[in-house]
């Protein structure tokens, strides 16, 4: 495949990445699948600067990101190391709260009103952000 050099229509370019901001809500798995079908992934926040950029675009809205601990440890969907990477949890989060009555704990991370992160039940229909890197090879065949 060829290297993507500019962002698709309706995506926002920032620091060699393209971002797409949903305006409806989906469960985390559906949001994750949506991004994959767009040859992208749920947003992976690697710096305070990227956090501020995403926060500015989503506003004060609960929004899924590409971070989960459904298989045990917290993991970013693109393989970025969680332990050594950027974190921005709300105080006392993540807490894997079981008191919601929906079954299980809280295994998916989202941006809250003020941008800080919370873990929540993955099935809640929150908005989401997709991200794809400009320098990565796209799945489309090269133009002849």
């Amino acid at each position: 495949g060829s290297e993507r050099t500019c962002c698709p229509v309706n995506w926002v370019e920032h620091e060699r990445s393209c971002y797409w901001f949903s305006r409806s809500g989906k469960a985390w798995a559906d949001a994750d699948n949506y991004c994959r079908l767009e040859d992208a992934h749920l947003v992976v926040v690697t710096s305070w600067e990227e956090q501020k950029f995403v926060q500015h675009h989503i506003g004060p809205v609960n929004t899924w990101m590409g971070l989960h601990d459904q298989n045990g440890p917290w993991k970013w969907v693109d393989g970025t190391d969680y332990e050594t990477g950027f974190k921005n949890w709300r105080p006392e989060q993540p807490d894997d709260w079981y008191g919601h009555g929906l079954g299980g704990g809280e295994d998916c991370a989202h941006f809250t009103d003020d941008g800080r992160w919370n873990d929540d039940v993955c099935q809640r229909p929150y908005r989401w952000v997709c991200e794809t890197e400009l320098d990565k090879a796209s799945q489309e065949p090269p133009l002849l």
Epitope: S24, A27, G59, P60, D113, N118, Q123
Partner: antibody, heavy 124, light 112 residues
């Protein structure tokens, strides 16, 4: 404007079944969870059941679990409540309710639109 | 289940006078996302409930500013600064932080 219209209520004997329906219009039905809430005569409100926007999850009050089934058809913008093994204590007005409050740019997990309700009377 | 307790259960108010309804929950309604999932509804006679206040203190669109909500954690209050004839009905508080979603018993407000 957003509208929810319930139907299917009536008088039924204990142990029998009834199916309530709710026709939705004026909003993107497939984007919202939907509830059934009931109100017995002269009493307060009791949450009955909820179904997720895509039908993937369903939850019930303990008082109706195993007897009632909530379902939806997003292609027809309809919500149903199948009520089996009805009891006298199920007598109530049943409301179809939209989940989520659309305020500016966000969705909140309250209930912002209620239908007018349909009356179910379980009596021998 | 979270128990919601409203007081008083009935209230008779002179038009133009203030009114206050209390709602207490058996558990905190503060979620990890920083929001508090407490709502107030008014059910006018012969009608379905209508949303007044969401998340403790936010007035829903079209709701007059004489209605205000306050509180945190487990203690909440709905205030009507100057009661009008059209405010009569049954007031319900509701929590949605935990399934099953639960309502208070309702407070009946009437005009003297």
């Amino acid at each position: 404007q957003v509208q929810l219209v319930e139907s299917g209520g009536g008088v039924v004997q204990p142990g029998r079944s009834l199916r309530l329906s709710c026709a939705a219009s004026g909003f993107t039905f497939s984007s919202y969870g939907m509830h059934w809430v009931r109100q017995a005569p002269g009493k307060g409100l009791e949450w009955v059941a909820v179904i997720w926007y895509d039908g993937s999850y369903k939850y019930y009050a303990d008082s109706v679990k195993g007897r009632f089934t909530i379902s939806r058809d997003n292609s027809k913008n309809t919500l149903d409540l199948q009520m089996n093994s009805l009891r006298a204590e199920d007598t109530a007005v049943y409301y179809c309710v939209k989940m989520g409050i659309e305020v500016a740019v966000d969705y909140y997990y309250g209930m912002d639109v209620w239908g007018q309700g349909t009356t179910v009377t379980v009596s021998s | 289940d979270i128990v919601m307790t409203q007081t008083p259960l009935s209230l008779s108010v002179t038009p133009g006078q203030p009114a206050s309804i209390s709602c207490k929950s058996s558990q905190s309604l503060l979620h990890g996302d920083g929001k508090t999932y407490l709502y107030w509804y008014l059910q006018k006679p012969g009608q379905p409930p209508q949303l007044l206040i969401y998340e403790v203190s936010n007035r829903f669109s079209g709701v007059p500013d004489r209605f205000s909500g306050s509180g945190s954690g487990t203690d909440f209050t709905l205030k009507i600064s100057r009661v009008e004839a059209e405010d009569v009905g049954l007031y319900h508080c509701m929590q949605s932080i935990q399934l099953p979603w639960t309502f208070g018993q309702g407070t009946k407000v009437e005009i003297k």
